[in-house]
C-alpha cells in the first residue's frame, strides 16, 4: 500500500465509504509526533488532522471523516515542516465494507437461505461460511447479493454460520479488506442454539483474500 519513503510504511483503510484511517509505521521517527496533513482536492490547501491515533503516546495515524467521497486523498506526513511521506491515493481502492447487518436464516428441510441488508453500493460479494462439529474446515458460499442459499445440509447436525462482505477484486483491485465477520450463530433442526457442541473456536478472519 504505501511504499517506503524515508522508512515510512503506511496503511489506508476506507471504512464503508464513511471514514478513512491512515496509519504509519516509521521506525526512524518512533519517538516523534509526526503530523498528518491532507486534502481531498488537488487545488485546496492542506488541512491538519484533528483526530490522531496514538501508539505509546506518539501519533501513529489519523481518522478522517470522508463520507461517500469519490476523491483522491492527497496527504503528507511531516516531522515539523519536513515531509517524510507524501502521496495521493484513490480512497476507494482501500475499501473495507461494514459487517453484515440484520442477518436472518430461513430453513427449508436440508437447505438454509441466509439474508442480510445489502449495502448501498455494489460490486460486492456476500460470503457465508458454515461448519458442523464434524467438519474439519469451514465451507463457504458467496453471492452478489446478501441472499445465499446453502443446500445439502444434515437437519440433525448443528451448524455454525457467519457472514462477511468482500469487495470484488475485479472491480476494486487487490488492496481492499473484507468486512469483519458477523456474530457466529448456531442452528440445529431449524432452531437457533447457544453453541454447537465440540465446535472448535472459529479462526480469526484473515485480511487477505
Amino acid at each position: 500500500q504505501g511504499g517506503a519513503a524515508e522508512g515510512v510504511q503506511i496503511q489506508i483503510i476506507y471504512f464503508n465509504l464513511e471514514t478513512v484511517q491512515v496509519t504509519w509505521n516509521a521506525s526512524k521517527y518512533s519517538r516523534t509526533n509526526l503530523t498528518f496533513h491532507y486534502r481531498f482536492n488537488g487545488d485546496e490547501a492542506y488541512d491538519q488532522c484533528t483526530n490522531y491515533l496514538l501508539q505509546e503516546g506518539h501519533t501513529s495515524g489519523c481518522l478522517l471523516d470522508a463520507e461517500q467521497r469519490d476523491d483522491i486523498l492527497y496527504f503528507s506526513i511531516r516531522n515539523g515542516t519536513h515531509p517524510v511521506f507524501t502521496a495521493s491515493r484513490w480512497m476507494v481502492y482501500y475499501l473495507k465494507p461494514s459487517s453484515p447487518k440484520h442477518v436472518r436464516f430461513s430453513w427449508h428441510q436440508d437447505a438454509v437461505t441466509v439474508t442480510c441488508s445489502d449495502l448501498s453500493y455494489g460490486d460486492l460479494l456476500y460470503e457465508v461460511q458454515y461448519r458442523s462439529p464434524f467438519d474439519t474446515e469451514w465451507q463457504s458460499k458467496q453471492e452478489n447479493t446478501c441472499n445465499v442459499t446453502i443446500e445439502g445440509l444434515d437437519a440433525e447436525k448443528c451448524y455454525s454460520f457467519w457472514v462477511r462482505v468482500k469487495a470484488m477484486e475485479d472491480v476494486y483491485g487487490p488492496d481492499t479488506y473484507p468486512s469483519d465477520w458477523s456474530e457466529v450463530t448456531c442452528w440445529q433442526r431449524g432452531e437457533i442454539r447457544d453453541a454447537c457442541a465440540e465446535t472448535p473456536t472459529p479462526p480469526k478472519p484473515k485480511l487477505s483474500k
Epitope: 469519490d70 476523491d71 484513490w90 455494489g122 460490486d123 477484486e169 475485479d170 483491485g173 487487490p174 488492496d175
Partner: antibody, heavy 125, light 106 residues
Framework: QVQLVESGGGVVQPGRSLRLSCAAS????????MHWVRQTPGKGLEWVAV????????YYADSVKGRFTISRDNSKNTLYLQMNSLRAEDTAVYYC??????????????????WGQGTMVTVSS | EIVMTQSPATLSVSPGERATLSCRAS??????LGWYQQKPGQAPRLLIY???TRATGIPARFSGSGSGTEFILTISSLQSEDFAVYYC????????FGQGTKVDIK
Amino acid sequence: QVQLVESGGGVVQPGRSLRLSCAASGFTFSSYGMHWVRQTPGKGLEWVAVMWYDGRNKYYADSVKGRFTISRDNSKNTLYLQMNSLRAEDTAVYYCARDRIMVRGVIIPHVFDIWGQGTMVTVSS
Amino acid sequence: EIVMTQSPATLSVSPGERATLSCRASQSVSSNLGWYQQKPGQAPRLLIYGASTRATGIPARFSGSGSGTEFILTISSLQSEDFAVYYCQEYNNWWTFGQGTKVDIK
C-alpha cells in the same frame, strides 16, 4: 453497438478556443465516468481530464488545468471539452474514452474500455 | 507523479514467436495497471486490466503479469495482426501511460 464519436477538431491559432464533443451510444452514458485522452507524436498518450457520471467531480492533468473544462450532458449522451488559451503543445489527436466500471453507488477509477476514433486538433499560427 | 517506463522501445519478432514487453512504474501501483494495443490510424484497444485479467474478446495468447512496480505483457505466439504499438497505463493514482513499445516484424 457501444460507440463513441468525437467531433469539433480543426486548425486554430494559439490563444484561441475550441470545443470538442463526444457522442455516446449503445450504453447507459449516465452511469459511467468519461475521459479525454490526447496523443501527440512527441508525448504519446496523455490523459487530459475525467468527469464522473453525475458531474460532481472533475479532474484535470496539470498541463491543461485552468485552460480546459470538461462537461457532460447526460440527457444528450454527450461529453464536451472546452479548450481555451490553446498552445502549440496542445496539438494532438483527442480521444474520448469510457471508464470500465459502471457506477453502482461508488465511483471506482479504472482502465478505459471503449474509445472513440479521435479528432485532430492543430494549434498553429 | 508516477512515471511509467516501457522497454524495449522497439521489439522485432518473427510471426509465431513469443514477445515479452516490460513496463516499470516509478513507485508501486499495486495491480492497477492496464495494457493497450494501438494500430496506425486507430484508437487504443484495451487488452489487460488489473495487471493480469484479459478484457472481453481478447485472445488467450495475450497475458499480463506483475504487481507493484514491475509488469510484463506476453504474447505467446505472434500473429500478423499483433504487430502494433503497446502501451501500459497505471490507474492507481491518476492515469499515466508509458511511452509505448513498437512490435514489428523481424
